[in-house]
């Protein structure tokens, strides 16, 4: 007889998850040699730890610590680029300014990007079929939790001037309920962080419009003083022109407003 | 509008949680929910505040830390625990809203702009 | 911390009275005032420095200021207007002793 397989709103666990992660895990540990100690069968050990044979909408960020402890590793605080809503340009700036650091430049965020997983209470099995959507189903699934805790970390660990991309073509240019807007803000470190500098990225090209001065980031501005953070921000008008200019700085039409 | 509970005569050294509870709005839409005292005859002293979005961001007042804290506890209800009372602390305990003041519940200051009655703590030996 | 002045002043019925508040750091024009009678929970009328409330906030409160310097001027005072009135900053609660100021009570003549 069939076992009836509980059926979840969102898309199953991506496929070959187990062979990603540990081959995710070997090229960045090539590639970081601080992190060359690392072990990487005992990390996907951790991180399959932390939702195999448990209900995906009880995961709790205890389950993940193990693998917390593994992925541990050292950025520099000052040197952290948060986003919101535009990863691929704030990739895209990382890979330029490498002394810059994404989430997903880390260990434990280069593993789980893009990828999507969860198992099932009470049998070893990973779900391909569905996993739990953080809206229709459950908050606690494997993969929400996961973001939230390596995104709480990241935070805490930020020091002096912490950057900020946001993207200046969604109604809602700060969010509250992103993870940025949930989480991050609200484990900034106000005895280690002075500024958090917002970057609001324009779509349109003949966008010349303040979006500083929107209430969403007027909003972030309310949550960031509050916390006795500094706030600033700039606008990013031509994205294009920003990352060739980070490319090239001393390229003679860098000097004019970006 | 908010309702606080709890007041109570206690000794000093007691503790003693309060209770604010909303009715008419819920805390799904993002505020500040603030304690504010007053004590017989003087002004308003802030306590602190919770943005009910996150249980990371709580504020207190310097002389508050440690011995006030601020909880959301459900949808609808925040508290204040407080320990360690003194003839001090003899107030009468406010529960006020931090409104949104923009379009679509963007909060960026707009003020305390629903309050309760309060409720009176007296500490006496 | 919020610092307010005077502390207490004397108004004729038609009269005008300013009360100021100083913050010890910038507030971003963050700064509300409320006004409260006794045995009641206080009022908000002003917020971010010069927005009236309500459509229920009678507009001969103004509220002024930037900076660290906040004013609430009242003009054409009734005696409904005796009352205490207090600042509060709402720009950082960080670090904080009193988002209040100490309060300014109207005696109105």
């Known amino acids: 007889v069939p076992r009836w397989r509980q059926q979840w709103s969102g898309p199953g666990t991506t496929k070959r998850f187990p062979e990603t992660v540990l081959a995710r895990c070997v090229k960045y540990t090539e590639i970081h040699p601080e992190m060359r100690h690392v072990d990487c069968q005992s990390v996907w050990d951790a991180f399959k730890g932390a939702f195999i044979s448990k209900h995906p909408c009880n995961i709790t960020e205890e389950d993940y610590q193990p693998l917390m402890k593994l992925g541990t590793q050292t950025v520099p605080c000052n040197k952290i680029l948060l986003w919101s809503r535009i990863k691929d340009l704030a990739h895209q700036f990382t890979q330029v300014q490498r002394d810059m650091f994404t989430l997903e430049d880390t260990l434990l965020g280069y593993l789980a990007d893009d990828l999507t997983w969860c198992g099932e209470f009470n049998t070893s099995k990973i779900n391909y079929q569905s996993c739990p959507d953080w809206r229709k189903d459950c908050s606690n699934n494997p993969v929400s939790v996961f973001w939230k805790t390596v995104s709480r970390r990241f935070a805490e660990a930020a020091c002096d001037v912490v950057h900020v991309m946001l993207n200046g073509s969604r109604s809602k240019i700060f969010d509250k309920n992103s993870t940025f807007g949930s989480v991050e803000v609200h484990n900034l470190q106000p005895e280690k962080v002075q500024t958090l500098e917002a970057w609001v990225i324009h779509g349109g090209r003949e966008d010349s419009r303040d979006l500083c001065q929107d209430p969403t980031i007027k909003e972030l501005e309310s949550i960031i003083s509050k916390r006795n953070i500094q706030f600033s921000c700039k606008n990013i008008y031509r994205p294009d022109k920003f990352l060739q200019c980070v490319k090239n700085p001393e390229d003679s039409s860098c000097t004019s407003e970006i | 509008s908010l309702e606080e509970s709890g007041g109570d005569l206690v000794k000093p050294g007691a503790s003693l949680t309060l209770t604010c509870t909303a009715s008419?709005?819920?805390?799904?839409?993002?505020?500040?929910m603030c304690w504010v005292r007053q004590a017989p005859g003087k002004g308003l002293e802030w306590i602190g505040c919770?943005?009910?979005?996150?249980?990371?961001?709580i504020y207190y007042a310097s002389w508050a830390k440690g011995r006030f804290t601020i909880s959301k506890t459900s949808s609808t209800t925040v508290t204040l625990q407080m320990s360690s009372l003194t003839a001090a602390d003899t107030a009468t305990y406010f529960c006020a809203r931090d409104r949104p003041s923009g379009n679509d519940d963007y909060i960026y200051d707009g003020g305390m702009d629903l309050w309760g009655p309060g409720t009176l703590v007296t500490v006496f030996s | 911390d919020m610092t307010q002045t005077p502390a207490s002043v004397e108004v004729a019925v038609g009269g005008t009275v300013s009360i100021k508040c100083q913050a010890s750091q910038t507030i971003n024009s963050w700064l509300s005032w409320y006004q409260q009678k006794p045995g009641q929970p206080p009022k908000l009328l002003i917020y971010q420095a010069s927005k009236l409330a309500a459509s229920g906030v009678s507009s001969r409160f103004k509220g002024s200021g930037s900076g660290t310097e906040y004013t609430l001027t009242i003009s054409g005072v009734e005696c409904a207007d005796a009352a205490t009135y207090y600042c509060?900053?709402?720009?950082?609660?960080?670090?904080?002793?009193?988002?209040f100021g100490g309060g300014t009570e109207v005696v109105v003549k």
């Open positions: 509060q900053q709402g720009y950082s609660f960080g670090n904080v002793d009193n988002a």
């Open positions: 008419g709005f819920d805390f799904t839409t993002y505020y500040y």
């Open positions: 919770i943005y009910t979005g996150s249980s990371d961001s």
